[in-house]
Amino acid sequence: GIAIPRNSGCPNSEDKNFPRTVMVNLNIHNRNTSTNPKRSSDYYNRSTSPWNLHRNEDPERYPSVIWEAKCRHLGCVKADGNVDYHMNSVPIQQEILVLRREPRHCPNSFRLEKILVSVGCTCVTPIVHHVA
Amino acid sequence: GIAIPRNSGCPNSEDKNFPRTVMVNLNIHNRNTSTNPKRSSDYYNRSTSPWNLHRNEDPERYPSVIWEAKCRHLGCVKADGNVDYHMNSVPIQQEILVLRREPRHCPNSFRLEKILVSVGCTCVTPIVHHVA
């Protein structure tokens, strides 16, 4: 859980379900100022397991737009650009938190939701050789 | 922005900064019931760009534990297990939303924060800069 002793300077919660419902400031603080977000933008094309990015939009969710990776090939790409049947392109998935409007269409009431997104693809060996 | 006309059934917001501050229900709804989260758990070891997972813990953040991928090699792993330095292992990064306690240590007051996390690694062809 996330129960931490309350500071005297904390806002009061009058919600009977406290701490299930909390106040969240939507003015996003971005911790990534030192990172150039475009740094990895061409990996999707240069990877041996390249992927395409598909836009997933849902106005009832925050963020409303999420980009989903779909591997271009089932196999991996060799140096000559052809498929390597002995290797597989697979999506790397991550569970992320989003805010879902609840009740629907309400601008100031949300519920936390976990969704699984594919972030990119990696090239893996299909068989794990077990040593006796 | 996320301004959507309010339903008559929506909770009222008495916050003077509305819609900057919203109510969020922390009872997480998990949309991933049909997906087995362990399915991709061994990709980090079987990838041609394998990675290690490092635990990043912060009690002032929700979720408090985030796993960060660090690529094991600069190059990619060949079929024989040796590293190919003509290729590069690179992290696939994603911006995710987390909740940051604000003011600090407050159990029921948060601010949305964007952080950049490395989810896994992929093998890419390096960019060759041609000198004129």
Partner: antibody, heavy 120, light 107 residues
Framework: EVQLVESGGGLVQPGGSLRLSCAAS????????MSWVRQAPGKGLELVSI????????FYPDSVKGRFTISRDNSKNTLYLQMNSLRAEDTAVYYC?????????????WGQGTLVTVSS | DIQMTQSPSSLSASVGDRVTITCRAS??????LAWYQQKPGKAPNLLVS???SLESGVPSRFSGSGSGKDYTLTISSLQPEDFATYYC?????????FGGGTKVEIK
């Protein structure tokens, strides 16, 4: 309409050779992976070989490796299978099949098959 | 090579019956599974790919499910034209391998 028509099957002696052809029509042949799959009489299906859209990648299972060669001529919309050192266990109906993608992983269209009989 | 074990090898059913065919891989094939229908003297016909994706033109009474090593093809209400042999095929690890087939016969 997608069509795949195999030819070149027949009776051959053990140790002999045969070349199968598969004429493709109704789709852009050069953008699809292709395969040969065989079926011995009364038996199940077995992969024989795979070739990607431009012929740059191929695969053979151990049962035919070194004896069979898959190739394609995209200008003629034709897939080939050169079979050498034929054995009795190669007797089967040989199907050519198309992958809905570039590479040859699973098969959305199949030919009617051509029977290869290896017998003395 | 990955072994694909289909069960049952044959079954008798009546029109309108719900029929379930299973396919077990010798190791995880990560949903890279196809199902085919084959009628006597004919070539196979693709029904499902990616374990669950129904091919265009395939009746909705067919459905695929499963994950890991275990997969299922279900025919919700068997029709006269569904009496045939069904094969699964994995395409996770070369060589792609097929199950031994399940013959669905009229009871």
């Amino acid at each position: 309409e997608v069509q795949l028509v195999e030819s070149g099957g027949g009776l051959v002696q053990p140790g002999g050779s045969l070349r199968l052809s598969c004429a493709a029509s109704g789709f852009t042949f050069s953008t699809y992976g292709m395969s040969w799959v065989r079926q011995a009489p009364g038996k199940g299906l077995e992969l024989v070989s795979i070739i990607n859209h431009n012929g740059g990648s191929t695969f053979y299972p151990d049962s035919v490796k070194g004896r069979f060669t898959i190739s394609r001529d995209n200008s003629k919309n034709t897939l080939y299978l050169q079979m050498n050192s034929l054995r009795a266990e190669d007797t089967a109906v040989y199907y050519c099949a198309r992958d809905p993608r570039h590479d040859g992983y699973f098969f959305d269209y199949w030919g009617q098959g051509t029977l290869v009989t290896v017998s003395s | 090579d990955i072994q694909m074990t289909q069960s049952p090898s044959s079954l008798s059913a009546s029109v309108g019956d719900r029929v379930t065919i299973t396919c077990r891989a010798s190791e995880d094939i990560y949903d890279r599974l196809a199902w085919y229908q084959q009628k006597p003297g004919k070539a196979p016909n693709l029904l499902v790919s990616g374990a669950t994706s129904l091919e265009s033109g395939v009746p909705s009474r067919f459905s695929g499910s499963g994950s890991g090593k275990d997969y299922t093809l279900t025919i919700s209400s068997l029709q006269p034209e569904d009496f045939a042999t069904y094969y699964c095929q994995q395409y996770w690890s070369v060589p792609w391998t097929f199950g031994g087939g399940t013959k669905v016969e009229i009871k």
